[in-house]
């Protein structure tokens, strides 16, 4: 069996979708003639070397665009970035590439994505909307960290 990424669509609890704008992912209310991104995700093949009970470690990319989500420090602040990267290249590496990995946890229909490189930091969108995706440590406050992930088959 050849492993391939799964495809999915994401929206938050306020029904905002992820859109690519100037190489940045932003969350906006769904409208007609809008093109939300399709997510590509694949589980890390080295799952046994990562923390257990934190969620399923996955690489997250944008389907068909050779762009992947990664976490890097800018100054002292972990930030979320889009990097030109083939998700399968990350998948095949001999070790987990932790800056590109997220622990995916599901509770009911809600999904969270926690940075493997920066434990305790989650992908989030500002409650205001129309803002870029960020990383946050503050759950359930000014930022939304719960997302609905629908797999596309």
């Amino acid at each position: 069996k050849i492993d391939t990424p799964q495809r999915g669509s994401i929206q938050d609890i306020n029904h905002r979708v992820w859109v690519l704008q100037d190489q940045t992912l932003i969350a906006v209310p769904r409208k007609d003639r809008m093109s939300p991104v399709t997510i590509a995700l694949i589980s890390c093949r080295h799952v046994e070397t990562l923390e257990k009970d934190r969620g399923n470690p996955i690489y997250l990319g944008l389907n068909g665009l050779n762009l992947c989500l990664m976490c890097a420090k800018v100054g002292d602040q972990p930030t979320l970035q889009l990097k030109e990267k083939d998700i399968m290249d990350l998948y095949n590496q001999p070790e987990p590439v932790k800056s590109f990995l997220f622990y995916h946890s599901q509770s009911g229909r809600n999904s969270t994505f926690e940075s493997v490189a920066f434990p305790g930091w989650f992908i989030a969108v500002s409650s205001e909307g129309g803002c870029p995706l960020i990383l946050t440590q503050e759950l359930g406050k000014a930022n939304t960290t719960d997302f609905g992930l629908t797999m596309l088959f």
């Epitope: 070397t49 923390e51 290249d89 590496q93 001999p94 070790e95 987990p96 932790k98």
Partner: antibody, heavy 121, light 109 residues
């Protein structure tokens, strides 16, 4: 600058254990993987195993599983290799090395100076 | 477990080109083996040269290049310098462990 500094030479008797240390500086060991490799006299390099210092998970060459134990103390940025049930053929220089992801790939980029372990009765 | 074999020794003239190879007993070396090349100079620490078959490590001169050649990993040195005299080791990845070769002693003469 990036440095891996290892502990000094050891002489052990067959059946004994040895614990070698590797102290990292110039980088955060939680951001990399630290490997242990050895070189017996006149031989090539032999991979022993590695640790992810951030999590503590390890991998070993099947040949050394059970005799080698790699641990870390992130508070002092030190990684340890403990080798048990020593035999004369374990006489070698033991190296720690950093496996670091840069750009698109992993590199064994920085190495310690090596620790000579001599096993002799 | 695979055995990784390298030429024991090679000689190159200053300014010349030489190719070192790394063979696996388990079959053709591919990009999935993520070949690494490491240099050991007398009295110096080991230093990483190549990762992922053909990626140069930061600061490594462009005269060093990695590739796949006839089912083997290869390290080519173009325009050899006297300071390139060293032992070169390759390492190959096999799904859950690394295997190093025996090393090639390169003489620049």
């Amino acid at each position: 600058q990036v440095q891996l500094v290892q502990s000094g030479a050891e002489v052990k008797k067959p059946g004994a254990s040895v614990k070698v240390s590797c102290k990292a500086s110039g980088f955060n060991i939680k951001d990399t993987y630290i490997h242990w490799v050895r070189q017996a006299p006149g031989q090539g390099l032999e991979w022993i195993g590695r640790i992810d210092p951030a999590i503590g998970t390890t991998r070993y060459d099947p040949k050394f599983q059970g005799r080698a134990t790699i641990t870390t103390d992130t508070s002092t940025s030190t990684v340890y290799l403990e080798f048990s049930s020593l035999r004369s053929e374990d006489t070698a220089v033991y190296y720690c090395a950093r496996l670091h992801y840069f750009g698109n790939n992993f590199f064994f980029d920085y190495w310690g100076q090596g620790t000579l372990v001599t096993v002799s009765s | 477990q695979a055995v990784v074999t390298q030429e024991p020794s090679l000689t190159v003239s200053p300014g010349g080109t030489v190719t070192l190879t790394c063979r696996s007993s388990s079959g053709a070396v591919t990009t999935s083996n993520y070949a690494n090349w490491v240099q050991e100079k007398p009295g110096q620490l080991f230093a990483g040269l190549i990762g992922g078959t053909n990626d140069r490590a930061p600061g490594v001169p462009a005269r060093f290049s990695g590739s796949l050649l006839g089912g083997k990993a290869a390290l080519t040195l173009s325009g050899a310098q006297p300071e390139d005299e060293a032992i070169y080791f390759c390492a190959l990845w096999f799904s859950n462990h690394w295997v190093f070769g025996g090393g090639t002693k390169l003489t620049v003469l």
